[in-house]
């Protein structure tokens, strides 16, 4: 038995509006009906939880109302979008997937997506 495999892209560049999207795909060893997805950020030897959602297979992901994350699920794929990013939020974003129900419990952790965020240059004042 090895850890459950979780795949995610190596690098993503956030849009000029501070939005980054990536797919987190897991190889489910069983028929899970309840899945928990957590996005973690590792930077400067610190690890913080960005957001988390538990969903029932076939249903939508539901993040907390004040979460910076949104997402959709399709089979063993989760499409994650993180909003409100600024240059200081650049870092390694890791997808953690837990198969919560039915037993047995499984845990998988992706290799991380390096998200680069570049703050847009302010528009110069126009004379016109």
């Amino acid at each position: 038995c090895k850890a459950m495999h979780v795949a995610q892209p190596a690098v993503v560049l956030a849009s000029s509006r501070g939005i980054a999207s990536f797919v987190c795909e897991y190889a489910s060893p069983g028929k899970a009906t309840e899945v928990r997805v957590t996005v973690l950020r590792q930077a400067d030897s610190q690890v913080t939880e960005v957001c988390a959602a538990t969903y029932m297979m076939g249903n939508e992901l539901t993040f907390l109302d004040d979460s910076i994350c949104t997402g959709t699920s399709s089979g063993n794929q989760v499409n994650l979008t993180i909003q409100g990013l600024r240059a200081m939020d650049t870092g390694l974003y890791i997808c953690k997937v837990e198969l919560m129900y039915p037993p047995p419990y499984y845990l998988g952790i992706g290799n991380g997506t390096q998200i680069y965020v570049i703050d847009p240059e302010p528009c110069p004042d126009s004379d016109f």
Epitope: Q42, Q46, V47, K96, I109
Partner: nanobody, 127 residues
Framework: QVQLVESGGGLAQSGGSLRLSCAVS????????IGWFRQAPGKERETVSC??????SYADGVKGRFTISRDTAKNMVYLQMNSLKPEDTAVYYC??????????????????????WAQGTLVTVSS
């Protein structure tokens, strides 16, 4: 699936020693980091130490007093606790995390990365 069972908790005098054991089944040790965590009454669960195939890491409060080791032949991980203090009193948990290349000495023990948890064993240090 991975399962963990601890043993070795109990009562110790201040300055004394205890050795905790964590038996891992359902997998070899190599794909995982095995960590020890503790939770004192009314406090959050905190990192004590962790180990993978080539390095170990310790929380500042236990460096020099606690030693983590692993026996791959027996699929066991041990936490030798010396010079125990009353503030070491807590429920101790071993847990497993998939070992990842991006883990650093500072992050490989981070509780966010762990998901397979044992039931916990109580360590009480009396003064």
């Amino acid at each position: 699936q991975v399962q963990l069972v601890e043993s070795g908790g109990g009562l110790a005098q201040s300055g004394g020693s205890l050795r905790l054991s964590c038996a891992v089944s359902g997998s070899t040790l190599d794909p995982f980091v095995i960590g020890w965590f503790r939770q004192a009454p009314g406090k959050e669960r905190e990192t004590v130490s962790c180990i993978n195939r080539n390095r170990a890491s310790y929380a500042d409060g236990v460096k020099g007093r606690f030693t983590i080791s692993r026996d791959t032949a027996k699929n066991m991980v041990y936490l030798q606790m010396n010079s125990l203090k009353p503030e070491d009193t807590a429920v101790y948990y071993c847990a497993a995390s998939p070992d990842k290349a991006f883990y650093t000495d500072q992050t490989m023990c981070n509780i966010h990365y762990y998901g397979y948890w044992a039931q916990g064993t109580l360590v009480t240090v009396s003064s």
